[in-house]
Interface confidence: low
């Protein structure tokens, strides 16, 4: 019940691919560090051919000192990577207790109570996804595939789609065959989901001196896990902004964690030999080597940790949830051994939490994070992670308390600020959220350069009438989160024509437009009949898009699926539409009636994807008072006429008439999407 779409997460660090080889690797890090020239001509390896990472340098090698220049470079790279990604987490869901109950854990099944769209985390579902799609960012750090993507959609709230109920798994670029593909149930709310930062998940680890496990001296460790960064177009590597500052560099370069206890130092040669196999990607051999060490030295924390890492690598290689569950268990075993070095304990539990999140076991992950915070009470980064853990299960109250605690101790913690601001905004404390979001983003701290924060800061400013909103959208655009200041959708295919308003001729869908305009009265009458006889079919917009007023929708198609129940209410309209696959097959859109009553204002908002265009057919339009702005042009509806706009651009609606306004919304695929893309892009 708890699978991960591995697809989503393999070999996709395009955002940091500085040398053009199709993935992020040590060479890219060197380029970003200025240790190597950026390649301009090497063609990117098609993702299908890219080697899956085997977590180079995951954690720190057993050897304590860098042996040569290469090692020193790697150490610098770790620092850089640390800047790039603040060890973060994923989404999903779990109930497994730490020392869990002995009954049948709900854990994995738990997510089966959720409707979110991720497909088995390791086992992928859609084998033909378009490779150029990018998500402009609702991804942040680390790991998951899961609903990461979805989140944005809701977060960005599929604006005009109050009832959009299925999330999306975006751009799966690598596709691996799997035996058991099971659909993972997930939900589709607007939500937190730590960005899928795809990639290198660098973990801040505090390494207390061995004799005093409480004081934490910061250490960084790189945990590499590969996720799709959706090749965002021109995303400036997050690092370049920060590492030029010598102070920053100093701050990041930290001592290596101590991973060996006294006993493990006596078997260091054996540990090194096994670790070398793992580093070289000989995972099966490494697994056997570490298993043998665990058998020989059952009390060795480092051997047990090596076994966990190998299982973790093997899970990634085989795209197996089952193997990953074993790794999660082994990371837990490390923590239960006697005399575990504090650094190793922290690394092991952090990775356990991370992998639990990857599998969607949010609850189990939360318990692991709670334990980490108890063990290392002075480590702010762990508290920040714990806050995210609470957010991921929807427990805003506890998350808020955690961030309040962090900010009371470290008032300038940018990570805590953006998340605290995020929570305030979710609680509709719009004005209060602004300074936290703003100062948090301005801090430049790891984990703060996330499209969601720019999105919500701009949105909050717009809602309080602060014109500075567009400055933040501009910055979000510059940093690669939005396609432009106006076009702020996050599920995007690169290179599609982008303009707010379209003519029927430009879309190529002239037959559909003619059919809608010829049959507008039939469509109108069926909509009015539903309003009269089955008003309950019109569902209110529930995504906090309205400043005020009353706005409901009655959906006939959603995600390319016909709603049979709804079509009973508008049978002729449904029959009419069946002839037009550009709309009925548009899995990133809906077909629906939209009724808006007088006194309604819909805040400026943005749709989730640039893959669709939205047609509005006027059905009942009051003489004056109704208007729609898309980008910087405002239009009005006419009865029997179609307006076409790209709702990935900011749009806003006013209804100040004296009677209701009824329109018919028909989403169509963006005309430049190929048939193959239309087939393979995941639904929204």
């Amino acid at each position: 019940f708890d699978l991960v779409d591995y697809e989503e997460v393999l070999g996709k660090l395009g955002i940091y691919d500085a040398d053009g080889d199709g993935d992020f690797d040590v060479d890219d890090a060197k380029v970003l560090l200025g240790l190597k020239e950026r390649s301009t001509s090497e063609p990117a390896v098609p993702p299908e051919e890219a080697e899956p990472h085997t977590e180079p340098e995951e954690q720190v090698p057993v050897e304590a000192e860098p042996q040569n220049i290469e090692d020193e470079a790697k150490e610098q790279i770790q620092s850089l990577l640390h800047e790039m990604v603040h060890a973060e987490h994923v989404e999903g869901e779990d109930l497994q207790q730490e020392d869990g109950p002995t009954g049948e854990p709900q854990q994995e099944d738990d997510e089966f109570l959720m409707a979110t769209d991720v497909d088995d985390r390791f086992e992928t579902l859609e084998p033909e996804v378009s490779h150029e799609e990018t998500e402009h960012s609702y991804h942040v750090e680390e790991t998951v595939s899961q609903d990461c993507n979805q989140d944005m959609e809701e977060m960005m709230s599929e604006q005009e789609n109050p009832d959009s109920s299925e999330p999306v798994v975006e751009d799966e670029r690598l596709h691996h065959d799997t035996d058991d593909v099971t659909y993972q149930v997930y939900e589709e709310q607007a939500v937190y989901e730590p960005l899928e930062n795809e990639g290198i998940e660098i973990t801040e680890v505090t390494a207390p001196p061995e004799d005093n496990p409480v004081e934490d001296s910061q250490v960084i460790v790189e945990e590499v896990s590969i996720f799709p960064v959706e090749e965002q177009q021109e995303v400036p590597p997050e690092t370049n902004r920060k590492t030029d500052d010598p102070e920053q560099k100093a701050k990041v370069k930290k001592k290596k964690p101590k991973l060996l206890n006294k006993f493990d130092k006596t078997i260091k040669a054996e540990l090194d030999a096994a670790e070398k196999l793992r580093k070289r990607g000989k995972i099966e051999e490494a697994v056997n080597a570490f298993k043998e060490l665990v058998r020989k030295y059952p009390q060795s924390p480092r051997a047990r940790y090596g076994k966990a890492q190998c299982e973790d690598d093997l899970a990634e290689k085989r795209r197996s949830n089952e193997v990953l569950r074993g790794a999660i268990e082994t990371y837990q075993e490390v923590a239960s051994l006697p005399d575990v070095p504090a650094d190793l304990l922290k690394l092991s539990l952090k990775r356990r939490s991370d992998r639990q999140q990857f599998l969607g076991h949010m609850r189990g992950s939360l318990l692991t994070l709670q334990r980490l915070v108890q063990l290392f009470p002075n480590d702010t980064s762990l508290k920040n992670d714990l806050g995210v853990g609470y957010l991921l299960i929807g427990d805003n109250d506890n998350a808020k308390k955690v961030y309040e605690e962090v900010l009371s101790v470290t008032p300038n913690d940018g990570f805590a600020k953006v998340h605290y601001g995020f929570i305030l905004k979710a609680q509709n404390k719009i004005a209060e959220s602004i300074p936290y979001l703003k100062e948090g983003i301005e801090s430049g701290d790891p984990g703060t350069d996330d499209g969601r924060f720019y999105f919500h800061l701009g949105d909050a400013m717009q809602r309080v009438g602060n014109k500075e909103a567009y400055k933040w959208y501009e910055l979000g655009h510059k940093r690669g989160h939005f396609a432009s200041v106006w076009q702020r959708s996050l599920y995007n295919v690169n290179g599609l024509k982008a303009q707010p308003w379209w003519t029927p001729k430009e879309t190529g869908y002239t037959e559909l437009v003619k059919s809608l305009e010829r049959n507008w009265k039939l469509i109108r009458d069926e909509g009015l009949a539903v309003m009269d006889k089955a008003k309950g079919l019109f569902l209110p917009e529930d995504e906090n898009l309205r400043e005020k007023g009353d706005w409901s929708q009655f959906t006939l198609w959603q995600q390319g699926r016909r709603n049979e129940n709804a079509c009973k209410g508008a049978p002729k309209t449904c029959t009419l539409l069946e002839k037009f696959p550009e709309t009925t097959g548009c899995r990133r859109g809906q077909i629906k009636y939209s009724i808006m009553h007088p006194g309604t204002h819909v805040w400026p908002h943005t749709g989730p994807t640039n893959c669709r265009l939205r047609m509005h057919l006027g059905l009942v339009i009051p003489k004056e008072g109704c208007k729609i702005r898309c980008a910087n042009e405002t239009k009005t509806w006419e009865e029997g006429k179609v307006l076409i706009f790209d709702d990935s651009f900011e749009h806003e609606v006013w209804q100040d008439a004296s009677s209701f306004r009824l329109i018919f919304i028909v989403d169509v695929w963006h005309p430049e999407l190929t048939p193959q893309q239309r087939r393979s892009l995941p639904a929204i």
Partner: antibody
Framework: QVQLVESEGGVVQPGRPLRLSCAAS????????MHWVRQAPGKGLEWVAV????????RYAGSVKGRFTISRDNSKNTLYLQMNSLRPEDTGVYYC????????????????????WGQGTTVTVSS | GIVLTQSPATLSLPPRERVTLSCGTS??????LAWYQQKPGRAPRVLTY???NKAAGTPARFSGSGSETDFTPAISSLEPEDFAVYYC????????AFSPGTKVDIK
């Protein structure tokens, strides 16, 4: 408004089957997992079964496993409970209940409380 | 499966009194515990989920606390409409289970 309405239950002889249905309206039925819960006369609540939002997985209480089947038809916004080999101890009021979902912006996560319940339908198993 | 216990089975109290209920679980359920209220002849309704999070429409006088195996919801001041049966429910492990219930009636 959000509503769940169970079909008429009825009196049925031991060993015979009965199918209950639960019609949902006023919300996006296909986005919610759904439960059946029952209550024997004068007794407490007993969880019976749950089904995922898309019908792809289900779970049952030990007392009904192998005899009851939960299913759903999202195109009809309807939840079903097929009860076979009924026993006198299956007598009671049967409720369908929706799994509530988060409305915050941070987590695509369903809360697992049963946030909307039907009015209940009585099933009597007696010879 | 996990067994839930509740005590007492019946509680007789006057209006405006503070009431504390208790629910115990045979194993650690972390915070995966919800409280429901049921009035005679009516369907139950959720009051709190995940121990302390109030469901929509739950009055402020209701609160929940506890973790792992011991949980204590409270009503700060009983109103006439609060006289009902209260159940706790765990969703940590399958099968999900309800407690036997505590009936709160008017003294």
């Amino acid at each position: 408004q959000v509503q769940l309405v169970e079909s008429e239950g009825g009196v049925v002889q031991p060993g015979r089957p009965l199918r209950l249905s639960c019609a949902a309206s006023g919300f996006a039925f296909s986005s919610h997992a759904m439960h059946w819960v029952r209550q024997a006369p004068g007794k407490g609540l007993e969880w019976v079964a749950v089904i995922s939002h898309d019908g792809s997985r289900d779970r049952y209480a030990g007392s009904v496993k192998g005899r009851f089947t939960i299913s759903r038809d999202n195109s009809k916004n309807t939840l079903y409970l097929q009860m076979n080999s009924l026993r006198p101890e299956d007598t009671g009021v049967y409720y369908c209940a929706r799994v509530g979902r988060s409305s915050n912006w941070f987590s695509r996560y369903y809360y697992y409380d049963m946030d909307v319940w039907g009015q209940g339908t009585t099933v009597t198993v007696s010879s | 499966g996990i067994v839930l216990t509740q005590s007492p089975a019946t509680l007789s109290l006057p209006p405006r009194e503070r009431v504390t209920l208790s629910c115990g679980t045979s194993q650690n359920v972390s915070h995966h515990l919800a409280w429901y209220q049921q009035k005679p002849g009516r369907a139950p309704r959720v009051l709190t989920y995940d121990v302390a999070n109030k469901a929509a429409g739950t009055p402020a006088r209701f609160s929940g606390s506890g973790s792992e195996t011991d949980f204590t919801p409270a009503i700060s001041s009983l109103e006439p409409e609060d006289f009902a049966v209260y159940y706790c429910q765990q969703r940590s492990n399958w099968p999900q289970a309800f407690s036997p219930g505590t009936k709160v009636d008017i003294k």
